[in-house]
Amino acid sequence: PEPPTACREKQYLINSQCCSLCQPGQKLVSDCTEFTETECLPCGESEFLDTWNRETHCHQHKYCDPNLGLRVQQKGTSETDTICTCEEGWHCTSEACESCVLHRSCSPGFGVKQIATGVSDTICEPCPVGFFSNVSSAFEKCHPWTSCETKDLVVQQAGTNKTDVVCGPQDRLRA
């Protein structure tokens, strides 16, 4: 018979034959042969594999480093990684939660809509037309552009979401 060119789901092609993948939580020890099944071994303590696989090494569980403010939210199993979260009052810097911050800052061009609390991080909003923020801040709102007219001046340089307008003297027409 012709050797297969493709295998079924949960199988892989090796040496012109289809072998069973190892189930989640197990790693590959040896490929199948014409006479033997794929040999798999369970992952060790603090290791995991979360898919049907042909990996020869299991992945290490994530370490929730207390020096970075992390703690274990959900302990890993042979099939799942450990899930970290931040100590109470702190906030993850990313979805993967690799480190913690007290709160995040809003970048220039954004203002603080809501200051962080123990349960929710800083909420930022883009500065609308007529407002700006030129700093990174965890408490400052967008500031309104300076009104040149009220100072008897004219706009010399338009404002942006990151910069204030620049005012200058009005051109005096000579008689």
């Epitope: 911050v101 007290l102 800052s105 801040s137």
Partner: nanobody, 116 residues
Framework: EVQLLESGGGLVQPGGSLRLSCAAS???????EMWWVRQAPGKGLERVS?????????YYADSVKGRFTISRDDSKNTLYLQMNSLRAEDTAVYYC?????????WGQGTLVTVSS
């Protein structure tokens, strides 16, 4: 290495005053937004007050408005919190924090106890 060292805490009677200091080193203090945060026994973190990098803008939690004053002296690389009319509910460990507010920039804090 960034270091923030809080001091000035102690035992004070209700209605009394204290001035906390936060000595910063290992970074250019001027221009950085700074915060005072506190943690009462058995409670979560509370953001108390903040000051902008220029010193021109400040923030105060409602619980301390009119009683606490935040300030900075960039020539001394020091942040201050003047606390007046202290109440029992102000009892907490007080910490200062700098942007980007990461856990590894966290100081040891200074304990303020308001009790008669």
């Amino acid at each position: 290495e960034v270091q923030l060292l809080e001091s000035g805490g102690g035992l004070v009677q209700p209605g009394g005053s204290l001035r906390l200091s936060c000595a910063a080193s290992g970074f250019t203090f001027a221009g950085y937004e700074m915060w005072w945060v506190r943690q009462a026994p058995g409670k979560g973190l509370e953001r108390v007050s903040a000051i902008s990098g220029s010193g021109g803008s400040t923030y105060y939690a409602d619980s301390v408005k009119g009683r606490f004053t935040i300030s900075r002296d960039d020539s001394k690389n020091t942040l201050y919190l003047q606390m007046n009319s202290l109440r029992a509910e102000d009892t907490a460990v007080y910490y200062c924090a700098k942007e980007p507010y990461s856990f590894d920039y966290w100081g040891q804090g200074t304990l303020v106890t308001v009790s008669s």
